[in-house]
Interface confidence: low
């Protein structure tokens, strides 16, 4: 990444697995060195309001109390370092939710996985990939959002009631597409527009529910950068 170049932003859903991609272009003559390549991932947590990210989020142990105002930016720390022989190190004990895919590493994919991602994981990440005589780097900013589906009115419904389902993700830009579906037996059944299903952006309006509408409803929000999030809601309609 050139100095002053914009850091790519990766979005993830709180509570879901997140991939921090890193597949640097490796010169052909160095491909044979991948087996012995090492990688170090570092995290600079976002400074933010007290609730957001006190302490070192990926480090174990108690987090220090947050300052009463937005404090100085937390220090960068090493999340995970994997040596040429696959030896892992980092803040002990290493958290199982921080993972590198061993097979991917041998193909030149040094992505870091957070399983699951937490709010405090937001911030800037840098990866340094060490080959025999050179180092390649990746840099990105992880932003985390919360996904939710709400029903209005909430709670159980009676036959012939109306309901609006709203599918949302806390991200400033609008999704490029919204797909609604029902979870049924063998898989997902798309919800088609009909006199009983009015689709409008991230809203689904059911003007007259029936007991057939009981059960899980889902939406998939897809953004222009390819990020997508799937959200479920269980609707209860009394006969």
């Amino acid at each position: 990444l050139q100095p002053g170049a914009e850091v790519p932003v990766v979005w993830a859903q709180e509570g879901a697995p997140a991939q921090l991609p890193c597949s640097p272009t490796i010169p052909l003559q160095d491909l044979s060195l991948l087996r012995r390549a090492g990688v170090t991932w570092q995290h600079q947590p976002d400074s933010g309001p007290p609730a957001a990210a006190p302490g070192h989020p990926l480090a174990p142990g108690p987090h220090p109390a947050a300052p009463s105002s937005w404090g100085p930016r937390p220090r960068r720390y090493t999340v995970l370092s994997v040596g040429p022989g696959g030896l892992r190190s980092g803040r002990l004990p290493l958290q199982p939710r921080v993972q590198l895919d061993e097979r991917g590493r041998q193909r030149g994919d040094f992505s870091l996985w957070l399983r699951p991602a937490r709010r405090a994981d937001a911030g800037e990440y840098r990866a340094a990939v060490h080959l025999r005589d050179r180092a390649l780097s990746c840099r990105l900013r992880l932003r985390l959002g919360q996904a939710s589906m709400t029903a209005s009115p909430p709670g159980s419904l009676r036959a012939s009631d109306w309901v609006i389902l709203n599918c949302s993700f806390s991200r400033p830009d609008r999704p490029a597409s919204v797909h609604w579906f029902r979870n049924r037996g063998q898989g997902r059944v798309p919800v088609r527009e009909s006199p009983h299903h009015h689709l409008a952006e991230s809203f689904l309006f059911l003007p007259q529910v029936s007991p057939m509408d009981s059960g899980p409803w889902g939406c998939i929000l897809t953004y222009r950068d390819g990020f997508n999030v799937s959200i479920m809601y269980n609707l209860t309609v009394l006969g």
């Epitope: 049924r184 299903h197 057939m212």
Partner: antibody
Framework: QVQLQQSGAELARPGASVKLSCKAS????????INWVKQRTGQGLEWIGE????????YYNEKFKDKATLTADKSSSTAYMELRSLTSEDSAVYFC???????????????WGQGTSVTVSS | DIVLTQSPASLAVSLGQRATISCRAS??????????LHWYQQKPGQAPKLLIY???NLESGIPARFSGSGSRTDFTLTINPVETDDVATYYC?????????FGGGTKLEIK
């Protein structure tokens, strides 16, 4: 009463395009889907696709995706189907039909137009 | 695509007798506790007309001589008793999965 009035018969040359119309009356045009169905002489029925006029959302049979384009004009309560790159295989009667309501799930076609005959011949 | 196979392709029934038409789907057309299969009647030179929706529900204005039954992959349209006005071709249609497909049709004649 619900009525779907289709445009008159079309005679077209191979490679040409035709645009069929289906004017709806007697109900709220934007509240129901309009389906299009093909029937070749002496043959069965084939579903081409559906348009939902309120939003313009369309659902196509993959087989007809490159052949048919469905549109709707809310102001005149009219649905259209354009057929392009016509060949003799497209010679058929084309019906428009309203999608009914039955609990909102994958509804049947409860009212049909009288059909438009399209003949492709050089 | 879901294939609907109708049998017989044609049948001749005496006035006042029962006519039974079968429609078999290549996979289940059931969902949400219902069977998404409909029956239509088409008379020569006319548009199809909806008879039965969701396997067994009689469309408004259709005589009770028509009835439908079945679930999952096997469905039956019964006309009892058959009248002269019933001479037509009958089609089943599934709408559980796109593309929404029709059976090949069954032509009913009077003996």
């Amino acid at each position: 009463q619900v009525q779907l009035q289709q445009s008159g018969a079309e005679l077209a040359r191979p490679g040409a395009s035709v645009k069929l119309s289906c004017k709806a009356s007697g109900y709220s045009f934007t509240s129901y889907g309009i389906n299009w169905v093909k029937q070749r002489t002496g043959q069965g029925l084939e579903w081409i696709g559906e348009i939902y006029p309120r939003s313009g959302n369309t659902y196509y049979n993959e087989k007809f995706k490159d052949k048919a384009t469905l549109t709707a004009d809310k102001s005149s309560s009219t649905a259209y189907m354009e057929l392009r790159s016509l060949t003799s295989e497209d010679s058929a009667v084309y019906f428009c039909a309203r999608g009914g309501t039955y609990d909102g799930y994958y509804y049947a076609m409860d009212f049909w137009g009288q059909g438009t005959s399209v003949t492709v011949s050089s | 695509d879901i294939v609907l196979t109708q049998s017989p392709a044609s049948l001749a029934v005496s006035l006042g007798q029962r006519a039974t038409i079968s429609c078999r789907a290549s996979e289940s057309v059931d969902n949400f506790g219902s069977s998404f299969l409909h029956w239509y009647q088409q008379k020569p030179g006319q548009a199809p007309k909806l008879l039965i929706y969701r396997a067994s529900n009689l469309e408004s204005g259709i005589p009770a001589r028509f009835s439908g039954s079945g679930s999952r992959t096997d469905f039956t349209l019964t006309i009892n008793p058959v009248e002269t006005d019933d001479v037509a071709t009958y089609y089943c249609q599934q709408v559980n999965k796109d593309p929404r497909t029709f059976g090949g049709g069954t032509k009913l004649e009077i003996k």
